[in-house]
């Protein structure tokens, strides 16, 4: 299992361990879900589900999610809240993850060009942490410059990747357009021909990044969309096989799947679509929208079912003097959201064949 190939078996893993985890996943045809966390509660829900499923997990903070982690009352001028929130989330996850006994990849999600000051802030924190501990604060980061030209996208990634590689840090990048909207990137009206990344584009990324370090993954577009999308989705995960083949032929390597790929915009996808992606080298699947809704359902159902017990601090159907503290205590109703979000993650771990891989 996974634990055999990791130097650090539990808690936040970095460097070679991240590379070995993704290599193992690719070889054994499973993918690791990446859960967007916005609070200690959502982080705990993900960690608990992964622990109970004997699975590794990726916890990631988006730009907006990081700002929320810091607190909605803080100004995000100069990406201040997003930087502080991401760092706070990282320290929180680093301190609590070992208690769950599973390997955790600590990641930051989509960073568009206009959000690069956020990336700079996280990277500075990584470098400071590296000086002190010999490893970066985060396991990995994502740059999403898919709105820019390929040339600018790749050159910006190269610039940052050189800094990251010095800390043996993983980079996820995106090329081609994933429809819908994500922090700072809105591709809802993208030209149809742009919804499928071309193999040549993917190879250009490989050619630029691989000489720096093998620690990178590519989110290529195959008709997928962020969020729940009402448009005419034509998901073609089998296209990822073309990317693997083209890069393999260009490089002349024997490895069947030289690329580490990422599945974005998976809400509403079928099990078979996920499996096709995973069989073709997908090692990470982003889960956000589905988890957000799952988290809500537990709280929603609790509030609806306990309506008569939460209308006032005292007084319920059992009597006018009966206290309602045990019903309105946040630890009770927030926990319900954790349970339903955890159940969704448990199901996803099964779908992605991650269950029992430790």
């Amino acid at each position: 299992g996974v634990e055999q190939i990791l130097k650090r078996k539990t808690g936040v893993i970095v460097g070679e361990d991240v590379h070995n985890l993704f290599t193992y996943a690719k070889e054994h045809k499973f993918a690791i879900p990446a859960i967007n966390v916005t609070s200690s509660s959502t982080a705990v829900a993900a960690l608990e589900a992964a622990r109970d499923s004997k699975s590794p997990i990726i916890l990631q903070t988006s730009n907006g999610g990081a700002a929320y982690f810091a607190g909605k009352g803080i100004s995000n001028e100069g990406q201040n809240a997003s930087i502080k929130g991401a760092i706070a989330a990282a320290h929180y996850i680093r301190s609590i993850a070992p208690a769950y006994g599973i390997p955790v990849v600590l990641h930051s999600d989509h960073c568009a060009k206009k959000l690069l000051p956020w990336f700079d802030g996280m990277l500075e924190a990584d470098e400071a942490y590296f000086k002190e501990h010999g490893e970066p604060l985060f396991s990995s980061h994502m740059l999403d410059l898919s709105e820019e030209t390929d040339e600018e996208n790749i050159s910006t990634c190269v610039k940052y990747f050189k800094r990251m590689a010095a800390m043996d840090q993983w980079l996820e990048m995106e090329i081609g357009i994933t429809g819908g909207e994500e922090d700072g990137v809105n591709n809802e009206n993208a030209d149809k021909e742009d919804l499928y990344t071309k193999p040549e584009q993917v190879y250009n990324v490989y050619k630029a990044l691989h000489p720096i370090s093998p620690n990178f993954s590519i989110a290529a577009a195959f008709g997928n969309c962020h969020g729940l999308y009402a448009g005419d989705i034509a998901l073609r995960p089998e296209i990822l096989a073309e990317h693997q083949k083209y890069t393999r032929e260009q490089v002349g390597c024997k490895e069947e799947k030289p690329l580490f790929l990422v599945f974005h915009g998976g809400s509403g996808s079928t099990v078979q679509e996920f499996h096709t992606g995973i069989d073709n080298g997908v090692v990470k699947v982003n889960l956000d929208t589905d988890c957000q809704y799952a988290y809500l359902t537990g709280i929603r159902d609790y509030v609806l079912n306990k309506k008569d017990y939460i209308m006032s601090p005292v007084g319920n159907p059992e009597g006018p003097e009966k206290p309602n503290k045990k019903f309105f205590d946040p630890r009770v109703w927030v926990r319900e959201g954790e349970k339903t979000m955890g159940a969704k993650i448990t199901k996803s771990l099964e779908t992605f064949r991650t269950t029992n891989t430790l």
Epitope: K192, E193, L195, Y196, K198, G223, D232, A234, R236, P237, E238, I239, L240, A241, E242, Q244, K245, T276, N280
Partner: nanobody, 119 residues
Framework: QVQLVESGGGLVQTGGSLRLSCAAS????????MGWFRQASGKEREFLAR????????FYADSVKGRFTISRDNAKNTVYLQMNSLKPEDTAVYYC????????????WGQGTQVTVSS
């Protein structure tokens, strides 16, 4: 637009095999995703299988996975559907379709070929 003509249909017994062919005309064949669909009498059109432009990637409907195999020969501008272990419920008109990489879904369709599986 790619023009498509299917062939290879016919009458076959349960458990038998058939190989359908779809000949495409048009210079863009090697940059298309090709697919097979079917429509049984009184039913909606059903997706069966897809294949990427070089043939590196395939995708199958659960109903035919393991029994049907899609392949293509770009030198001959032809896509195939090998159908094994046929059942009476496979009886339908089988259609070939093409999706250009600048299109969001299949947009070119053949006229279809009838497959009848007798018990």
């Amino acid at each position: 637009q790619v023009q498509l003509v299917e062939s290879g249909g016919g009458l076959v017994q349960t458990g038998g095999s058939l190989r359908l062919s779809c000949a495409a005309s048009g210079r863009t064949f090697s940059r298309t995703i090709m697919g097979w669909f079917r429509q049984a009498s009184g039913k909606e059109r059903e997706f069966l299988a897809r294949i990427t432009w070089s043939g590196a990637g395939t995708f199958y409907a659960d109903s035919v996975k393991g029994r049907f195999t899609i392949s293509r020969d770009n030198a001959k501008n032809t896509v195939y559907l090998q159908m094994n272990s046929l059942k009476p419920e496979d009886t339908a008109v089988y259609y070939c379709a093409a999706q250009g990489l600048d299109q969001r879904d299949f947009s070119s369709w053949g006229q279809g070929t009838q497959v009848t599986v007798s018990s």
